[in-house]
C-alpha cells in the first residue's frame, strides 16, 4: 500500500457562512516541514501555498475574496513533505449567504415560554426556496433543516431552559447559497429556580471551532522539543 | 487580437493591469481550444511563487513586473495543440501567497487573444 502523511485539519476562520462580496479564509493545519498545501474545491484543485520556511510553519491560509455562489461549496486541502502527500482532509463546506431576500422568523406560542411547553419556529420567505434554516446563535453547525414553498416551520417539542438563546433563519435556494438572515428571535424559557440556576447559557461568540490555530515554530520550542526528546530517552 | 507562430516557436503574451492594486493581486493565464472547455495554463502569487498545468510545464513561462503593472507569459516549443485563445486573469484582493489554480476563484478577466500554432 502507498506511503501516506497523515490528513490534515481543514477550518473556516470566522465562520463558514460568507455573506456575497466578502472574503472567506480556509486553515490548513498540516505538519512542520511540508513544502506544499493545496486546496481542493468540489474535487478540483483551486490553490496552491508554499509555506516559507516550510520547517517553521504548520499550516497555511487559503484566501478566497469576492464571495459568490461560484466558491460556494465542498472544500479538502491537503499537504506534502518531500514527495510523500498526506491524506485528504475532512470536508468542509463553505456557505455563501446574503442572497437575494431576507426571510421573517416568528415564533409560537411567543417568545417567552415556561420549561415543558412545545414551541414552534416559522420561518417565512415569499421569494422561491423550498428548503429553510434554523440556526441557534452559537451553535451555527447544529441547522435545522425544513421545507415548505413559502414558509417552513420547525418544531422544538417540549422546550428546556437548554433551548434558551438567540435564533436566525435562512432561506436556501441550494445547500450552499442562503438568503441574507432574518432578524434574530431571542427564546426566553422560565423553569423551576433549581432548572434555571443549573442551566448553561449558550455562548454568544462565534463557534470556538471556528478559528485557525496555526504555529510558527520559534528555535526555544524546537529546543525544547529537543531537550523533551532527550529526557524521555534517559528515563526509558 | 491573433498571433500567429510556428510549429516549435516562441512566443511571449503580456497583459497590463489598471488601478493599483497590481502588487497585490495574484495573476494566472487560462485557455479555451476551440470547442473545449477553459483550462488553466499557469499562476503566479504576490511574491512570486508560480504553479503550472502539466502540459505546459518546462515549456511555458509565468512571471511579473509590478512596476509595469504587467504579467508575462512566455511560451517556447509551442505545438498545435497550444492553439487556443489565451485569457490572462487576477485575483483581486489577496493576502498571502496563494497561488490560485481554478478559474472561479479569479474576480478579473483580460479579453483574450488568439494563438495559432501552424503545425
Known amino acids: 500500500p502507498k506511503q501516506t502523511l497523515p490528513k490534515p485539519i481543514i477550518r473556516a476562520e470566522s465562520t463558514y457562512m460568507v455573506p456575497k462580496e466578502k472574503q472567506a479564509t480556509l486553515c490548513c493545519q498540516g505538519s512542520y516541514g511540508a513544502v506544499e498545501y493545496q486546496l481542493h474545491f468540489e474535487g478540483s484543485l483551486f490553490a496552491v501555498e508554499r509555506p516559507k520556511p516550510p520547517e517553521r510553519i504548520n499550516g497555511v491560509k487559503f484566501h478566497i475574496p469576492d464571495m459568490n455562489s461560484r466558491k460556494a461549496g465542498r472544500y479538502s486541502c491537503i499537504y506534502r513533505v518531500g514527495e510523500l502527500w498526506s491524506e485528504r482532509s475532512d470536508l468542509l463546506d463553505l456557505v455563501v449567504t446574503e442572497m437575494y431576500d431576507t426571510p421573517t422568523l416568528s415564533v409560537h406560542p411567543g417568545p417567552e415560554v415556561t420549561s415543558g411547553e412545545k414551541v414552534t419556529f416559522y420561518c417565512r420567505l415569499d421569494t422561491a426556496t423550498s428548503m429553510f434554516l434554523l440556526l441557534k446563535e452559537g451553535r451555527s453547525r447544529d441547522v435545522q433543516r425544513s421545507y415548505g414553498k413559502v414558509q417552513a416551520e420547525f418544531p422544538m417539542g417540549p422546550v428546556t431552559t437548554a433551548h434558551r438563546g438567540s435564533y436566525r433563519c435562512f432561506g436556501s435556494y441550494n445547500n450552499y447559497a442562503w438568503s441574507f438572515p432574518s432578524e434574530p428571535v431571542k427564546l426566553l424559557v422560565t423553569g423551576d429556580i433549581e432548572n434555571t440556576s443549573l442551566a448553561p447559557t449558550d455562548p454568544t461568540f462565534p463557534d470556538s471551532w471556528d478559528t485557525c490555530l496555526l504555529t510558527r515554530e520559534t528555535g526555544l520550542q524546537k529546543d525544547l522539543a529537543l531537550w523533551d526528546h532527550t529526557a524521555q530517552n534517559l528515563l526509558r | 487580437e491573433v498571433q500567429l507562430v510556428e510549429s516549435g516557436g516562441s512566443l511571449r503574451l503580456s497583459c497590463a493591469a489598471s488601478?493599483?492594486?497590481?502588487?497585490?493581486?495574484?495573476m494566472g493565464w487560462f485557455r479555451q481550444a476551440p470547442g473545449k472547455e477553459r483550462e488553466f495554463v499557469a499562476a503566479i502569487s504576490r511574491s512570486d511563487d508560480t504553479y503550472y498545468a502539466d502540459s505546459v510545464k518546462g515549456r511555458f513561462t509565468i512571471s511579473r513586473d509590478n512596476a509595469k503593472n504587467t504579467v508575462y507569459l512566455q511560451m517556447s516549443s509551442l505545438r498545435a495543440e497550444d492553439t487556443a485563445v489565451y485569457y490572462c486573469?487576477?485575483?483581486?484582493?489577496?493576502?498571502?501567497?496563494?497561488?490560485?489554480?481554478?478559474?472561479?476563484?479569479?474576480?478579473?478577466w483580460g479579453q483574450g487573444t488568439l494563438v495559432t500554432v501552424k503545425p
Open positions: 486573469a487576477a485575483v483581486v484582493p489577496t493576502y498571502g501567497n496563494n497561488i490560485y489554480v481554478h478559474s472561479a476563484a479569479y474576480n478579473y
Open positions: 488601478g493599483r492594486t497590481f502588487a497585490s493581486a495574484a
